[in-house]
Interface confidence: low
């Protein structure tokens, strides 16, 4: 059974870059789309973007200028970088898998990131 | 690796009868990735059911799929002469069952 595990620093300073990694176990990164979603405290879900392991990607326009996603197939990991963070980027960040741009069928457990000096 | 075992190997029935084909997995399978295919002589297989229970486009509603975990079933409620073929179950991106031949009695 496929499992996703997010990892990264829990605290990031304003204006710095947030870096998160999602490790996939129980399945190959190939043939799926991989997404990042976040959820600010007490709020709803916001889709950050997805990429296909072969190199295709699509990001939420509201975050596009600050987002980079990449994959390391040798480690079965994919990552998120979010630049120039502010307090508004404080959230629980989830990685998730989908079938060819479709519904998010498997999610990581989420990792909390606080942006504060 | 997951092994899919289909039974019976051959099923002999008459048109109008109900056919029940079984597919058993050696370990639990996510039914979202369990498909059934129909293959007629000289033709490529075509998908009948995907996600264990969803009929593929153009498949008549006499075909239905069910099951979860390790036990899956393909049912044809009233056999039409054109339904006589070999049926395979498969976990996507992985192995197929060995097939069930549905023949006219």
């Amino acid at each position: 059974q496929v499992q996703l595990q997010e990892s990264g620093p829990g605290l990031v300073k304003p204006s710095e870059t947030l870096s998160l990694t999602c490790t996939v176990s129980g399945d190959s990164i190939s043939d799926y789309y991989w997404s990042w979603i976040r959820q600010p405290p007490g709020k709803g879900l916001e889709w950050i973007g997805y990429f296909f392991y072969s190199g295709g990607s699509n990001y939420n326009p509201s975050l596009k200028s600050r987002v980079t996603m990449s994959v390391d197939t040798s480690k079965n990991q994919f990552s998120l970088k979010l630049g120039s963070v502010t307090a508004a980027d404080t959230a629980v960040y989830y990685c998730a898998r989908s079938q060819l741009r479709y519904y998010l069928d498997v999610w990581g457990q989420g990792t909390t990131v606080t942006v504060s000096s | 690796e997951i092994v899919l075992t289909q039974s019976p190997g051959t099923l002999s029935l008459s048109p109008g009868e109900r056919a029940t084909l079984s597919c058993r997995a050696s370990q639990s399978v996510d039914s979202n990735y369990l498909a059934w295919y129909q293959q007629k002589p000289g033709q490529a297989p075509r998908v009948v059911i995907y996600g264990a229970s969803n009929r593929a486009t153009g498949i008549p509603d006499r075909f239905s799929g069910s099951g979860s975990g390790t036990e899956f079933t393909l049912t044809i409620s009233r056999l039409d002469p054109e339904d006589f073929a070999v049926y395979y179950c498969q976990q996507y991106g992985s192995f197929f069952g060995q097939g069930t031949r549905l023949e006219i009695k």
Epitope: W47, G49, Y53, S54, N58, P61, R101, Y102 | G51
Partner: antibody
Framework: EVQLQQSGPELVKPGASMKISCKAS????????MNWVKQSHGKNLEWIGL????????SYNQKFKGKATLTVDKSSSTAYMELLSLTSEDSAVYYC????????????WGQGTLVTVSA | DIVMTQSHKFMSTSVGGRVSITCKAS??????VAWYQQKPGQSPKLLIY???YRYTGVPDRFTGSGSGTDFTFTFSSVQAEDLAVYYC?????????FGGGTKLEIK
């Protein structure tokens, strides 16, 4: 309309190698992985492996490692499978297949290529 | 962007009760809508995809319906463990967007 057009039947001698082609049309070739499936003498289907045409990363059923090599030519939207050191056990019909959009099954199949290995 | 609106932030019902959560898309999304359940401290879990298909292992007391712009998620008989927030999401066009969520409370 999605179509997968495979090369014609082949009669080859034991020990030889040969290559089957699968020309894709009706969709963006690099958007979907291409799968290959073996069917021996009208019997069971076996998944051989898949290749992602975008970055040419392939994944194989362990059983076919060393037997099959998957490649693509993006310029002609064609996938290839080379079968190595053929024996009578390799006599079969070989299919290329692609899954449907957002679904977990092979929705599109080539017509099949019959390979006969005989002295 | 397509806006997904869940008009009720909260819904309250008794165990065994029937309740429906609605979701409205700002434009036609055909049937490209998924529903997720999120329990406190947990990540979302897929329940329904393509508007009406139950995902693997989801109990049949959960059903989804709708097409175009209006979608409904229905509990035929609410159980205590259904206490959660429910989100709709469109997977019709980029960027994918979610509804604001509806919290199901048990009386």
């Amino acid at each position: 309309e999605v179509q997968l057009q495979q090369s014609g039947p082949e009669l080859v001698k034991p020990g030889a190698s040969m290559k089957i082609s699968c020309k894709a049309s009706g969709y963006s070739f690099t958007d979907y992985t291409m799968n290959w499936v073996k069917q021996s003498h009208g019997k069971n289907l076996e998944w051989i492996g898949l290749i992602n045409p975008y970055n040419v990363i392939s994944s194989y059923n362990q059983k076919f490692k060393g037997k099959a090599t998957l490649t693509v030519d993006k310029s002609s939207s064609t996938a290839y499978m080379e079968l190595l050191s053929l024996t009578s056990e390799d006599s079969a019909v070989y299919y290329c297949a692609r899954k449907g959009y957002g679904s977990s099954m092979f929705a599109y199949w080539g017509q099949g290529t019959l390979v006969t290995v005989s002295a | 962007d397509i806006v997904m609106t869940q008009s009720h932030k909260f819904m309250s019902t008794s165990v065994g009760g029937r309740v429906s959560i609605t979701c409205k898309a700002s434009q036609d999304v055909t049937t490209a809508v998924a529903w997720y359940q999120q329990k406190p401290g947990q990540s979302p879990k897929l329940l329904i995809y393509s508007a009406s298909y139950r995902y693997t292992g989801v109990p049949d007391r959960f059903t989804g319906s709708g097409s175009g712009t209006d979608f409904t998620f229905t509990f035929s008989s609410v159980q205590a463990e259904d206490l959660a927030v429910y989100y709709c999401q469109q997977h019709y066009s980029i960027p994918w967007t979610f509804g604001g969520g509806t919290k199901l409370e048990i009386k």
